[in-house]
Amino acid sequence: LVITPPGPEFVLNISSTFVLTCSSSAPVMWEQMSQVPWQEAAMNQDGTFSSVLTLTNVTGGDTGEYFCVYNNSLGPELSERKRIYIFVPDPTMGFLPMDSEDLFIFVTDVTETTIPCRVTDPQLEVTLHEKKVDIPLHVPYDHQRGFIGTFEDKTYICKTTIGDREVDSDTYYVYSLQVSSINVSVNAVQTVVRQGESITIRCIVMGNDVVNFQWTYPRMKSGRLVEPVTDYLFGVPSRIGSILHIPTAELSDSGTYTCNVSVSVNDHGDEKAINVTVIENGYVRLLETLEDVQIAELHRSRTLQVVFEAYPTPSVLWFKDNRTLGDSSAGELVLSTRNVSETRYVSELTLVRVKVSEAGYYTMRAFHADDQVQLSFKLQVNVPVRVLELSESHPANGEQILRCRGRGMPQPNVTWSTCRDLKRCPRKLSPTPLGNSSKEESQLETNVTFWEEDQEYEVVSTLRLRHVDQPLSVRCMLQNSMGRDSQEVTVVPHSLPFKV
């Protein structure tokens, strides 16, 4: 871009006519304060482009900056612009007139700012004063911009002398604003809604006084705009919120809602997004399944948990053997359903100090008007094994018969063992397992019965010893996943006159 005359600053005589030409290899135009002043564009014989800006019969009001810019958007390499500044000293005009909004200067932190009182004559001396105090402040003055410095929250006025009269500017008001690093949070009252229900999304900014909110949302694509409401939420720290509300959601309102926040007084900004799903009907669906058989241990507490997803909030019922369960006053049974996220639920059945009678078939059912789901399982109460009796008998044929009876849940296993050295048995010498032996020294028979009312197994094991030629310590041991139990008996040969 080439400007002729080259500038960068001109001081023009009042009432004169002044012509500025900007030339380039691409089309150009003149701008003044984002306005396009009167100008003529031309394409020259040599292929260059020019725009001629004519300032006719100039006055002090023509004082200001002018830019020559490319007048097409051919990319960033053409975003260059050239600036010139024109003064038209005008004794009838003191300070250049200002738009009323430019008299209010918002300052962030301790950043340098400008009080933009400008005069038409670069030779004039200009001073800055606090309005209440008439002492000039020592702040540097730029005739093209104004006073540049760090200012307190006060009221200021500029002064100059034209000829023999003192001229005051308008009053400038400086306000300090709280502008911290911008931190935006977006939340929705619900991110899942049924069609016809409302969508409400809040965008909140903390610790900033002056911010702009800009929303993008699915409805914008079809040109249906929603007017957000912005609120100042008092408190410490201060919060400003913008609320987007759609009273009657449609399926097409599903999608991403983005809140873009920019600070008016600087270039800081942030944006956050949230997804909203509009569904035709409500739903309930299980997120986890349970094994068909659940185990509880006798006299221990057991919590059974079902995780599911639903919208809207469903009702939840638990059943045992087809009978509805409720919290028991004795505190033996606790039912609870809690909302762990917007659409996620955990329903728990807690059995306190489980009893055998609590074994059975359980069902959880979650339902609402649109959908329902249920989950069933069998609760097995495990009971530690007990050896209830270990007895012996001596039939006439010379055999010794040992009978061991015990109970437990799950089904206990029976192990018989023997030890011949009574003094060292069983601590110092491992017992020898007994069972059906090929030598027919012993014969073992075990019967198992499940007692429905007690929900446990009974095991009766009979051990037949063909002949016992010396004293034996015989042990019957029952074992299941809950533990083990055993009893011992000493068996002596028939020929011995005593029994230990």
Partner: nanobody
Framework: EVQLVESGGGLVQAGGSLRLSCTPS????????MAWFRQAPGNEREFVAA??????????SMKGRLTISRDNVRDNGQKTVFLQMNNLQLQDTATYYC????????????????WGRGTQVTVSS
């Protein structure tokens, strides 16, 4: 280098008319303002008229008796500027100069970088 060649001057009776022409020797791509100035012996150079784009300007001394115009671009890119002077008076006697500028004050001779050698206009009674 661009040269400006003036023509059309001469002796004319008071109340008569003249049409002055100014022709650049080569194309004047960088030139924005074409103007006429005059200088009588012992006087300063005085602005007469100027033309740029679709705009024209006239000095106070001959206002109402002048028309400045420009012909269409010829094949070689040269533009001839014309000054039509009517109802000439004795005090219009002077050397008339053609000048070209790329921008600046329209009325000020200091804004013009290129000057012709001038053409003499003499108004007799």
């Amino acid at each position: 280098e661009v040269q400006l060649v003036e023509s059309g001057g001469g002796l004319v009776q008071a109340g008569g008319s003249l049409r002055l022409s100014c022709t650049p020797s080569i194309t004047t791509a960088g030139t924005t303002i074409m103007a006429w100035f005059r200088q009588a012996p012992g006087n300063e150079r005085e602005f007469v008229a100027a033309i740029w784009g679709s705009k024209t300007a006239y000095g106070d001394s001959m206002k109402g008796r002048l028309t400045i115009s420009r012909d269409n671009v010829r094949d070689n890119g040269q533009k001839t500027v014309f000054l039509q002077m009517n109802n000439l008076q004795l005090q219009d006697t002077a050397t008339y100069y053609c000048a070209a500028s790329s921008g600046g004050y329209v009325h000020s001779s200091t804004s013009y970088e290129i000057w012709g050698r001038g053409t003499q206009v003499t108004v007799s009674s």
